[in-house]
C-alpha cells in the first residue's frame, strides 16, 4: 500500500500521478473543508454522573465534567477520535462537588482537527494499488468548560 | 513534491522506495514516539488577565481562563498548533468573575495529537524529490479546566 497526500479526489485525474510522473507543486495545496461527525451527537446531560469527583481523571474532577465518546472510522487518520460529552448543563459547585450552580454553564469546547481520509487513487488497481490521503478539518469537542453566561449587549 | 508516509527516517534506506519498487507493507508501520514542544513554555500567571469575562470567546469566559500560544513548524502537518496557557492558578469565582476561589484549581488538559513531520527521503535529490512523512504523537495543552483538587488517599 502506498499512500499519497493530495488535494482531494474531487477532480480524480489529478489526484494520483502515475508512478512515472512526478506530481506538480500544487498537488499539495490541500483543501480545508470542514467535516462534521457522522451524526449530531446530542449533548445529553446525565444527572446520575453530574458530579465532580475528588480523584480520578481530569474529566471527572472538573466542575464541568464530561465523558468521552468514541468516533471510529477505519479510513481516517487518526482512526479513533473522542468527542467530549458534557454531563451537566451547569457547573458543579466547588464546595459540594454535586449541586449545580446556575451562575455557570458547562459548555463543549470545539476544535477543527486536521484528519486524513484514505481514498483509492483514480485508475489504480491490483494488490499494490495506491491510496490518496485527503486532508480535512473535522469538528471535535475536546472538553467541557465552565463559563460565565454570555451577557447580550 | 511527492509525500510518502512511512515509519520514520531512522532507517533511511527503507524510508522511500524507488519509483519502480512498490513499498513493503511494513513501510506503513509508523512510529508513535511522543514529541515535546520546541521549548518548555512556562505557565506564568498573568494577574491582569486572571478574570472571566461575560462576553468574548470561550477561553476568556471560562472560570479557568487561558490564552493560546502559537507553535509553528513549517515541516509539520499541521504547521500551526496552539498551546493553552492557564492565566490563573485557581478558578475564578462565578459570582465576581475576578476573585480566585482556592477550592478549585485551574489546570491544563493535555492531549497527544497525531502530527506528521516532513523529512527528505534518503537518496532523493533534484527539483522533484520526494519527502517522507513521519507520524508522531505531539503533546498539546488544549484548554484549562477548573477541577476540584485531588484528594490523596
Amino acid at each position: 500500500v502506498s499512500l499519497r497526500i493530495q488535494e482531494g479526489c474531487s477532480h480524480l485525474p489529478s489526484c494520483c500521478p502515475s508512478k512515472e510522473q512526478e506530481p506538480p507543486e500544487e498537488w499539495l495545496k490541500w483543501s480545508s473543508a470542514s467535516v462534521s461527525p457522522p451524526e449530531p451527537l446530542s449533548h445529553t446531560h446525565h444527572a446520575e454522573s453530574c458530579r465532580a469527583s475528588k480523584d480520578g481523571p481530569l474529566n471527572s474532577r472538573a466542575i464541568s465534567p464530561w465523558s468521552y465518546e468514541l468516533d471510529r472510522d477505519l479510513n481516517r487518520v487518526p482512526q479513533d477520535l473522542y468527542h467530549a460529552r458534557c454531563l451537566c448543563p451547569h457547573c458543579v459547585s466547588l464546595q459540594t462537588g454535586s449541586h449545580m450552580d446556575p451562575l455557570g454553564n458547562s459548555v463543549p469546547l470545539y476544535h477543527n482537527q486536521t484528519v486524513f481520509y484514505r481514498r483509492p487513487c483514480h485508475g489504480e488497481e491490483g494488490t499494490h494499488r495506491r491510496y490518496c490521503l485527503e486532508r480535512r478539518l473535522y469538528r471535535v469537542s475536546l472538553a467541557c468548560v465552565c463559563v460565565r453566561p454570555r451577557v447580550m449587549a | 513534491v511527492s509525500l510518502r508516509i512511512q515509519e520514520g527516517c531512522s532507517h533511511l534506506p527503507s524510508c522511500c522506495p524507488s519509483k519502480e519498487q512498490e513499498p513493503p507493507e511494513e513501510w506503513l508501520k509508523w512510529s508513535s514516539a511522543s514529541v515535546s514542544p520546541p521549548e518548555p513554555l512556562s505557565h506564568t500567571h498573568h494577574a491582569e488577565s486572571c478574570r472571566a469575562s461575560k462576553d468574548g470567546p470561550l477561553n476568556s469566559r471560562a472560570i479557568s481562563p487561558w490564552s493560546y500560544e502559537l507553535d509553528r513548524d513549517l515541516n509539520r502537518v499541521p504547521q500551526d498548533l496552539y498551546h493553552a496557557r492557564c492565566l490563573c492558578p485557581h478558578c475564578v469565582s462565578l459570582q465576581t468573575g475576578s476573585h480566585m476561589d482556592p477550592l478549585g484549581n485551574s489546570v491544563p488538559l493535555y492531549h497527544n495529537q497525531t502530527v506528521f513531520y516532513r523529512r527528505p527521503c534518503h537518496g532523493e535529490e533534484g527539483t522533484h524529490r520526494r519527502y517522507c512523512l513521519e507520524r508522531r504523537l505531539y503533546r498539546v495543552s488544549l484548554a484549562c479546566v477548573c477541577v476540584r483538587p485531588r484528594v490523596m488517599a
Partner: antibody
Amino acid sequence: QVQLVQSGAEVKKPGASVKVSCKASGYSFTGYTMNWVRQAHGKNLEWMGLINPDNGGTSHKQKFQGRVTMTVDKSISTAYMELSRLRSDDTAVYYCAREGYYGPSPFHHYAMDYWGQGTLVTVSS
Amino acid sequence: DIQMTQSPSSLSASVGDRVTITCQASQDISNYLNWYQQKPDGTIKLLIYYTSTLHTGVPSRFSGSGSGTDYTLTISSLQPEDIATYYCQQYSKLPYTFGGGTKLEIK
C-alpha cells in the same frame, strides 16, 4: 500470557442492577480497548459496547443507552460493565473481550482476540 | 446497523470433510470481517481477522475469503476438535454486529 478473568454468576431481580468485572493480565491494560458482548441462552452473540481504558472513552449499542455503564480501574487492570433496570430478557452470559489491532499502522484492523470465560447473569423474580 | 446473515445455521459433516460457512453483510464491509469459534463449554476464540488472516496458533486447515458483502470460512479437513459454533463479525462500522452463528456437528 493474556488472560481475562470475570466475576462469578449473579442472580438478580427485575429492576435491579448488576456489575460484572473483568480482570486483565499478561498485557498492558491501557493499551487495548475492552469490549463487552452478551449471549442469551441458545442465541446469537450481541455486542454491547467498548471502553478505552486509557481515557475512559466509550461506545455502545444504542439499545443499551442509559442502561449500560462501562468503567475501568487502571490500578488493578480491571474493567467493569454495569447494567441497570434489569429485565428478564437480560438473562445471558456476559463476556469481556480484549480488542487487538493488527495490520499496517495507521490503518489498523480490529478483532476481539482474547475473551473472558463469561459470567452468567440470571434475572428472575 | 449492519446486518450479518450466516448460513447454514447448522451443519453435520464427517471427519476429513471440507466444510464451508458463508456470511453475508447488508452492505459492503470492505473485508472488515472476523471469524470466531465458540466451543460447547462457552469458550470463544478468534480464528481469522480481516477476512483471511489467521490469528496466532490457529491451524492452517482454517481459511477465509470474500469481498464486498459476501464472505466464507472454510475448514479444509474437518477434525473432531472443530466441533463448535462459528460466528462472523463485521468491524466496518460501530456498532459491531455478529452473524447468527453456524453450529457444526460431526456425523
